[in-house]
């Protein structure tokens, strides 16, 4: 007996779509082997129509796809625009068509509903509007117009021209009688519900000479679109509900048990706590369409999502909706990186950001998530040499270590830096990741003076004290600029006296600037790293002034001035907006497996023992 399972019979009508799910035991071999859908011939063969290796028969071109869900042990064959020619016997299977790993499926496509018995068929999506047109003859022009719904054996009055409205339709129905030239009245029903579906009869006049017209209203619940994204990655739901709801509150909700749909985010300012820091509802276009981006996907994010429009900002009967079924692939190509990074006031953090290594030339960005209104993410820095003004001297985006990871360093931390940050690129939109920076109690590990003033033409020596815990690290000084931090020569001055309980392994490493010029003014960082992995940094601002008295300056910690005031927000403020980070591609190309090797202990801020997903700002 074959271990493959699926629907034995599928019945549909012309013009419809079907989604045929085939289940297989999710062994390693099965998950990665070829999946196929073939049609059985009269003489026993089975001709492939579509397979997971990219083959699509001309019969299915543009109307079918096959999606494998290895995590669930399923694959789904979607076939649209069905015709009666599609009726027949099929197999869904694994491996080679002729081998036994398959399941027989009978597909029967019947004729679509037509104008049978003078019945006009109206097929409308849930939540939308239908206009039922009812013609009549001149002799009934002045007579009562009415619409009935067939309930069981009896017609029930829905609306009439004398002003009656059935309570089930209150506030969402109207009867329009066209101008004298047209012998037609119409009934408009808004916010269609599933329960509105059925047989209707419109009538002009009440006697034997009345004009009657039958209508069949079909209300379609939207088929969920299958979305399959990687754990730790990102998903974008594009929601286009039509211009008629452009001014109505929008929402995205996730269906829980039964019919409940818990609001994830809406335009009225509501946001589910589980999505804090990792969701954006992008401003809607004039036509009422909008999109929702969720980053840092978790296993528990999988499920059925609905977007819709309703004044309450949540799902109600009659809301127009769109639906998605989100699957989260745990065999993710996106490497694990800490979701929480901890730093101390005055200290620093080094954040590792993954990106699709196939896109090494893409522009890298880092932005700060803001929860106000629907959420936004103003850019702070990019890999093209742009840094937001008030982050000058304390923020740098480095292409290192490369090969699928870049580094963002932020120092001179204050409590205001606590929050959620997004790593992203202008390439693969699925690789947006989120990291939370937490500011914890403690002292910075590296000790440097505050502001330093150098004298033109003289020599300046600036000290940086490294505690003994960094004895095995590479220590460096560099000069900060918009494109990074250019390494400078430095001198190891031997053990530092700046630390209590620290042995000979502590170090004082000095930066020496000979014959200071105006160009030497700016921010300097001292820091530690191991190979291409960065740890803590400390920043010093060097001001340059005219000579007052000859000699060189040797700055000590005690002589240092206070740190300069934080710079004000500049007018070049940039922000991730609808167009900047949106991309309609919901499905990524097959991605190369990312480098997930552990970084050397302490090569970046240390991992907190409480969680493998947290990393501290100070190394062990």
């Amino acid at each position: 007996k074959s271990p493959i399972f699926g629907p034995e019979e599928v019945n549909s009508v012309e013009g419809n779509s079907v989604s045929i799910t085939c289940y297989y035991p999710p062994t390693s071999v099965n998950r990665h082997t070829r999946k196929y859908w073939c049609r059985q011939g009269a003489r026993g063969g089975c001709i492939t129509l579509i397979s997971s290796e990219g083959y699509v028969s001309s019969k299915y071109a543009g109307r079918a796809n096959l999606t494998n869900f290895p995590e669930n042990g399923t694959f789904v064959v979607n076939i649209a625009q069905l015709s009666q020619d599609d009726s027949g016997r099929y197999k869904c299977g694994l491996g080679i068509n002729s081998r036994g790993l398959s399941f027989d499926v009978s597909l029967e496509v019947s004729q679509g509903p037509g104008l049978l018995n003078d019945t006009k068929v109206y097929t409308v999506d849930l939540g939308r509007t239908v206009t039922i047109n009812c013609p009549f003859k001149t002799e009934n022009a002045q007579k009562r117009k009415s619409l009935y719904k067939q309930i069981g054996l009896y017609p029930v009055l829905v609306i009439d021209s004398s002003g009656y409205v059935n309570p089930n339709y209150t506030g969402r129905i109207r009867l329009d009688i066209q101008g004298t030239g047209q012998l037609l009245f119409s009934v408009v029903i808004n916010q269609l519900r599933l329960s509105d579906a059925g047989q209707y009869l419109c009538q002009a006049g009440d006697d034997s000479n009345s004009n009657k017209k039958n209508a069949d209203l079909q209300v379609l619940k939207p088929e969920p679109e299958l979305v399959y994204e990687d754990l730790r990655g990102s998903v974008t739901f594009h929601c286009a509900l039509g211009p008629e709801v452009a001014n109505v509150a929008k929402f995205l909700c996730r269906q829980s048990s039964g019919e409940n749909c818990d609001v994830v985010v809406n335009t009225l300012g509501k946001r589910a706590p589980a999505f804090e820091g990792r969701i954006l509802l992008n401003p809607q276009d004039k036509d009422g369409s909008f999109s929702v981006v969720i980053t840092g996907l978790r296993k528990e994010d999988a499920g059925r999502y609905l977007c819709g429009a309703h004044s309450d900002g949540q799902l109600q009967e009659g809301s127009p909706i769109q639906a998605w079924q989100l699957f989260v692939n745990e065999e993710s190509t996106i490497p694990r990186s800490p979701t929480v990074v901890k730093g101390v006031a005055g200290g620093s953090v080094a954040v590792l950001c993954p990106y699709n290594r196939k896109e090494s030339k893409s522009i890298k960005y880092w932005c700060l998530w803001e929860g106000a209104q629907n959420g936004r993410c103003p850019l702070l820095v990019d890999s093209e040499g742009w840094v937001k003004a008030q982050y000058e001297g304390r923020l740098s985006l480095l292409e290192e270590p490369g090969n699928g990871t870049f580094t963002v360093i932020l120092n001179q931390l204050t409590s205001r830096d606590a929050g959620f940050y997004w790593c992203l690129t202008n390439g693969d939109t699925l690789w947006r990741t989120t990291v939370e920076i937490k500011i914890i109690e403690g002292e910075p590990n590296l000790k440097v003076p505050g502001n330093v003033t150098a004298v033109l033409g003289e020599t300046l020596k600036v000290p940086c004290h490294f505690p003994c815990k960094f004895s095995s690290y590479e220590k460096y000084w560099c000069k900060w600029n918009n494109t990074g931090c250019q390494a400078l020569p430095s001198q190891d001055e031997g053990p530092s006296k700046a630390f209590v309980n620290c042995d000979e392994n502590s170090r004082l490493v000095s930066l020496t600037l000979n014959l200071v010029t105006r160009a030497d003014e700016g921010w300097y960082w001292c820091g530690v790293k191991q190979g291409h992995f960065y740890g803590e940094t400390a920043a010093v601002y060097v001001a340059v002034e005219e000579r007052k008295a000859a000699g060189s300056r040797d700055v000590s910690l005690a002589k240092a001035d206070a740190a300069p005031d934080e710079k004000v927000l500049d007018s070049g403020f940039r922000e991730i907006e609808n167009k900047a980070i949106q991309d309609p591609r919901l499905f990524a190309e097959e991605k190369a497996v990312a480098d997930t090797r552990d970084q050397a202990d302490g090569s970046r801020a240390s991992v907190d023992s409480g969680s493998s997903e947290e990393q501290g700002g100070s190394s062990r």
Epitope: S17, S19, I20, T21, Y23, L194, Q218, K221, G258, Q325
Partner: nanobody, 126 residues
């Protein structure tokens, strides 16, 4: 919360037929999937058949042991899902349960159904 009630069980001779019904109350029967399961004394509950619908498309699933003998159908007017059982065998004797499932993607043979009926007893005598 939807309540499911099975009916139609009883005693029947081997080779005979029986029709079980699963009626929904509490709200309209617009669940995506309704399945029939059975449990014989001292045995584990097993999947029998399921019907899944979405708009005007219907998917029917059967266990190997009942293929060709049992037919599942949906009656919109009565708001029921019916199980027509022909060519009954003594090994079909069991308590038959119907279950409703919201998810359109779960394996219909699985146990992640949202609501279950109390069951109806079917006895097939030889």
């Amino acid at each position: 919360e939807v309540q499911l009630v099975e009916s139609g069980g009883g005693l029947v001779q081997s080779g005979g037929s029986l029709r079980l019904s699963c009626a929904a109350s509490g709200r309209t029967f617009d669940q995506f999937t309704v399945g029939w399961f059975r449990q014989a004394p001292g045995k584990e509950r097993e999947f029998v058949t399921a019907i899944r619908w979405s708009g005007s498309t219907t998917y029917r699933y059967y266990a190997d042991s009942v293929k060709g003998r049992f037919t599942i159908s949906r009656d919109n007017a009565r708001n029921t899902v019916d199980l027509q059982m022909n060519s009954l065998k003594p090994e079909d004797s069991a308590v038959y349960y119907c279950a409703g499932q919201m998810s359109q993607w779960s394996d219909p043979r699985g146990d992640d159904y949202d609501s279950w009926g109390q069951g109806t007893l079917v006895t097939v005598s030889s």
